[in-house]
Interface confidence: low
């Protein structure tokens, strides 16, 4: 349905509060280095303009596209060239090239200081003094650090952020009330950002067919009672929503997401029995709830898949008539029967099935050729099952920190060219799979673990794309989305790698170690561990364990000393010398 003024249409649909929030997020995700005040000024100008268009859709410039309006506004920033360098060249382009240019300059690892949490009283005062500015600042700070954050979901986070302050700033013990809520929001926010980044990578690097396949598998697991046609409709709508958000079309994305939530709630009977409690909630909460809804129960009497997909003589005819629909139906049928499989495994099975049909439908006896296709699935299923089993055993044996260290060593040996901060970040997150998934019942472990690992490995791929240093990483990241995790799992010690020269400064520690939080201490130690492996890639587990145990003892000793700095100065070189000897 066409509108004379797109900006007026979206303003009326979304309402002023959501409109302003989404425009602020959009601008902050594009111009990540701009000061807060500059963005607020731009947002206010766009909002005032939108109001004039609501009053009169025929007013000057109201017929322009949102990309044109927003792009023109971004290009008025005076310091664009100094702050963003070549991104300023985008402004010389016409739409749609200009928006594509802005998108290409989004920085997944912006050089921004980590967010420091002020004292609770300071935050509560700021919240009470100017609630609107306080919440805008939250949107701005998160959006500029996470340029692909799912914008309508970020509005939901902001609403929870506001609720936390409104409740806790009145509490007797403000800190006890507020800090756990902020920790939860931070952790959930990081997870949400990473999940969305994978969706955008899937769409941008592998196309909407890849995203649709992912969505068919996931929605079929969630809604096993829904018909294939119903799942297909949801997949089409969901693909549109995420394509828009990943493309920077945040107003359209939020509007379409609201429409999708409305549709799902109006058609619960044909989708899932689990939607009811979501549908009673207000919009932002409702959309979030629907996205996170648990899997519905599987219908009791689902027939064997073999009849339609192996035993039938019409397999090749059905495949030839409409390949994508036939494969989509296969994926739907397989996924709704297997909530215990990861989405990535289901996609590998569909890919294997497609490859078998491509080969067999051209053979002399197609039926004979594809008769054993399900047997070929067995090794594909067993590989992630075994991986989860082994890694959960290791996690239970070692605990999270040492499990992370085992992964740090494993991944540094695989891809030692990758920067140390990236290896530490990625391995620490890979290690969190243990606490997240290993405590779950058997039937939920694989979907939890492998789909989480896909999200974490996508972060590695995204960071590596910015500064490529390893052909092996490039290969695993670009060849196949569904095989990324098996590709990384299969990597061995890089024999071609020339060990990094020993640099004593890397292993120089100071008294400030003692005042760090437990997490910061772990990161310091893990950074040293990566550097050790880069220096001695063939070091054994035992050797590395010995060095790390000595390191922990050395830090503990010096942190107990009266003159900590002197202790680090005197014991540090001894630790370095002993470590070099132990690894010689």
């Amino acid at each position: 349905d066409t509108h004379k003024s797109e900006v007026a249409h979206r303003f009326k649909d979304l309402g002023e509060e959501h409109f302003k929030g989404l425009v602020l997020v959009a601008f902050s995700q594009y111009l990540q280095q701009c000061p807060f005040e500059e963005h607020v000024k731009l947002v206010n100008e766009v909002t005032e303009f939108a109001k004039t268009c609501v009053a009169d859709e025929s007013a000057e410039n109201c017929d322009k596209s949102l990309h044109t309006l927003f792009g023109d506004k971004l290009c008025t920033v005076a310091t664009l060239r100094e702050t963003y360098g070549e991104m300023a060249d985008c402004c010389a382009k016409q739409e749609p090239e200009r928006n594509e240019c802005f998108l290409q300059h989004k920085d997944d690892n912006p050089n921004l200081p980590p967010l420091v949490r002020p004292e609770v009283d300071v935050m509560c005062t700021a919240f009470h003094d100017n609630e609107a500015t306080f919440l805008k600042k939250y949107l701005y700070e998160v959006a500029r650090r996470h340029p692909y954050f799912y914008a309508p979901e970020l509005l939901f986070f902001a609403a929870r952020y506001k609720a936390a302050f409104a409740e806790c700033c009145q509490a007797a013990d403000k800190a006890a009330c507020l800090l756990p809520k902020l920790d939860e929001l931070r952790d959930e926010g990081k997870a949400s950002s990473a999940k969305q980044r994978l969706k955008c990578a899937s769409l941008q690097k592998f196309g909407d067919r890849a995203f649709k396949a992912w969505a068919v598998a996931r929605l079929s697991q969630k809604f096993p009672k829904a018909e294939f046609a119903e799942v297909s409709k949801l997949v089409t709508d969901l693909t549109k929503v995420h394509t828009e958000c990943c493309h920077g079309d945040l107003l359209e994305c939020a509007d379409d997401r609201a429409d999708l939530a409305k549709y799902m709630c109006e058609n619960q009977d044909s989708i899932s029995s689990k939607l009811k409690e979501c549908c009673d909630k207000p919009l932002l909460e409702k959309s979030h709830c629907l996205a996170e809804v648990e899997n519905d129960e599987m219908p009791a009497d689902l027939p064997s898949l073999a009849a339609d997909y192996v035993e039938s003589k019409d397999v090749c005819k059905n495949y030839a008539e409409a390949k994508d629909v036939f494969l989509g139906m296969f994926l739907y049928e397989y996924a709704r029967r297997h909530p215990d499989y990861s989405v990535m495994l289901l996609l590998r099975l569909a890919k294997a099935y497609e490859a078998t049909l491509e080969k067999c439908c051209a053979a002399a006896d197609p039926h004979e050729c594809y008769a054993k296709v399900f047997d070929e699935f067995q090794p594909l299923v067993e590989e992630p099952q075994n991986l989860v089993k082994q890694n959960c055993e290791l996690f239970e044996q070692l605990g999270e920190y040492k499990f992370q260290n085992a992964l740090l060593v494993r991944y540094t040996k695989k891809v030692p060219q990758v920067s140390t901060p990236t290896l530490v970040e990625v391995s620490r997150n890979l290690g969190k799979v243990g606490a997240k998934c290993c405590k779950l019942p058997e039937a939920k472990r694989m979907p939890c673990a492998e789909d989480y690992l896909s999200v974490v490995l996508n972060r590695l791929c995204v960071l590596h794309e910015k500064t490529p240093v390893s052909e092996k990483v490039t290969k695993c990241c670009t060849e196949s989305l569904v095989n990324r995790r098996p590709c990384f799992s299969a990597l061995e010690l890089d024999e071609a790698y020339v060990p990094k020269a020993f640099n004593a400064e890397t292993f120089t520690f100071h008294a400030d170690m003692c005042t760090l939080s437990e997490k910061e201490k772990q990161v310091k130690k893990q950074t040293a561990l990566v550097e050790l492996v880069k220096h001695k890639p063939k070091a054994t587990k035992e050797q590395l364990k010995g060095v790390m145990d000595n390191f922990a003892a050395f830090v503990e000793k010096c942190c107990k000393a009266d003159d900590k700095e002197a202790c680090f100065a005197e014991e540090g070189p001894k630790f370095v010398a002993a470590s070099q000897a132990a690894l010689a």
Partner: nanobody
Framework: AVQLVDSGGGLVQPGGSLRLSCAAS????????MSWVRQYPGKEPEWVSS????????RYADSVKGRFSISRDNAKNTLYLQMNSLKPEDTAEYYC?????????RTQGTQVTVSS
């Protein structure tokens, strides 16, 4: 060959000042952290202060904090130690080292005596 030549020591009254220098050669000076160490007769060497390769991170033993200042000139391949408010207990032989090691290597050291 790596060489470190210390200079600037001498006799000074309590409360006085001295500036020690360490001229380095034979290695990429700007790539290495450097330290000053002192040794009392018959005692183990004691770390005094360190500075990183770029010169933007300095560290001090508690006993000299606020009185001594370490710096470097990478263009001149030279390390310095500005010593103010000197006390009798600062009397020792001072020498520079590469990195954070307190073990003396390839350096003669320079004697500092604080006495009235």
């Amino acid at each position: 060959a790596v060489q470190l030549v210390d200079s600037g020591g001498g006799l000074v009254q309590p409360g006085g000042s001295l500036r020690l220098s360490c001229a380095a050669s034979g290695f990429s000076f700007g790539s290495f952290g450097m330290s000053w160490v002192r040794q009392y007769p018959g005692k183990e060497p004691e770390w005094v202060s360190s500075i990183n390769g770029r010169g933007d991170d300095t560290r001090y033993a508690d006993s000299v904090k606020g009185r001594f200042s370490i710096s470097r000139d990478n263009a001149k391949n030279t390390l310095y130690l500005q010593m103010n408010s000197l006390k009798p207990e600062d009397t020792a032989e001072y020498y520079c080292t590469i990195g954070r090691s307190v073990s003396r290597s390839r350096t003669q050291g320079t004697q500092v005596t604080v006495s009235s």
